[in-house]
Amino acid sequence: QKPSIGKCSVDIQQNRTKTTERPDLLNCPIYWQQVQEKCLLFSHTVNPWNNSLADCSTKESSLLLIQDKDELTRTQNLIHDKAISFWIGLNFSLSEKNWKWINGSFLSSNDLKITGDAKENSCVYISQTSVYSEYCSTEMKWICQKELTLVRNKVSPDSWL
């Protein structure tokens, strides 16, 4: 079972200095959205799948990996416009004749139902309601993901309240 990420509570001591180092927190970078144990960044521009992959790398992240139907639904709930779709980190491996995530794992048959062709140069994108395959050269928006990381934030004690 995955660990749940709740809100952090902090014991505030009686004697406080002006600035105190806050305990470890799970934080997403600015502009990234927290979705359970991940931080997601929805692009504002469009790119072919390979360029999208590269862009996520430059942000020290990866194209979105979806573990199960629940995560798919949670992500789709963040897509507020039915007329926009996003590349994810899944493409067709011709050598293995299977859908392959960019972390090297293969798509389980019950994970996602992909509408479209499973063939060379096919990559996967998600919309508000569906999952599709498309030519990887197609220019679309994309989603990068980061695992939530532990950071030490210096904060004013008053901001704890």
Epitope: T45, V46, P48, D81, K82, A83, I84, S85, T115, D117, Y125, S127, Q128, Y132, E134, Y135, S137, T138, E139, M140, K141
Partner: antibody, heavy 122, light 108 residues
Framework: QVQLVESGGGLVQPGGSLRLSCAAS????????MSWIRQAPGKGLEWVSY????????AYADSVKGRFTISRDNAKNSLYLQMNSLRAEDTAVYYC???????????????WGRGTLVTVSS | DIQLTQSPSSVSASVGDRVTITCRAS??????LAWYQQKPGKAPKLLIY???VLQSGVPSRFSGSGSGTDFTLTISSLQPEDFATYYC??????????FGGGTKVEIK
Amino acid sequence: QVQLVESGGGLVQPGGSLRLSCAASGFTFSQYYMSWIRQAPGKGLEWVSYISPSGATIAYADSVKGRFTISRDNAKNSLYLQMNSLRAEDTAVYYCARSLMSTGTHLYFDLWGRGTLVTVSS
Amino acid sequence: DIQLTQSPSSVSASVGDRVTITCRASQGISSWLAWYQQKPGKAPKLLIYAASVLQSGVPSRFSGSGSGTDFTLTISSLQPEDFATYYCQQVTSFLPYTFGGGTKVEIK
């Protein structure tokens, strides 16, 4: 205001050339697949060509391949269609159209210009 | 090329009538089908895409259904502004994108 405005149509002799332009406004032009679609007088619709957001991918209907060239200038929010070796059967209203962003190269046209009439006649 | 055959080519109907237009593809196109409305002297307007998804701003009296080769556009209660010509369009990966011949909805 979100709109597309075509220009450049007119009367041209067979074998002649024309360049159509489409000015886009009110949306982020550089993110959309754009197409030209035509309609001969009293007839149905015919897709002519599309171009991807960056201009890297282009496709044409067989009827215009080798004669028409689609291009775009994202800095100017403009789409173009260079038409050479024009024939009588190219006579039509030419529409510039934007595609829905959600469906990749499955191009559904959600925004159209009013069209510009091209007449090819001697 | 994938051919789309619309029927009927024209239909006479009255305000309040239920109108059904069909579009048949020469080969299977999954759900890659759109419906457009065009009025004289105007550009077409997207009504339905992906066979059944209502485009934003389009009245709910319009609906689409079908998959594979047979598709239907239904206007549940015809309004005065609905008298127009309707076209289906297929958008599979097999170029060119093609349109049906059109169905003219006229006032009875």
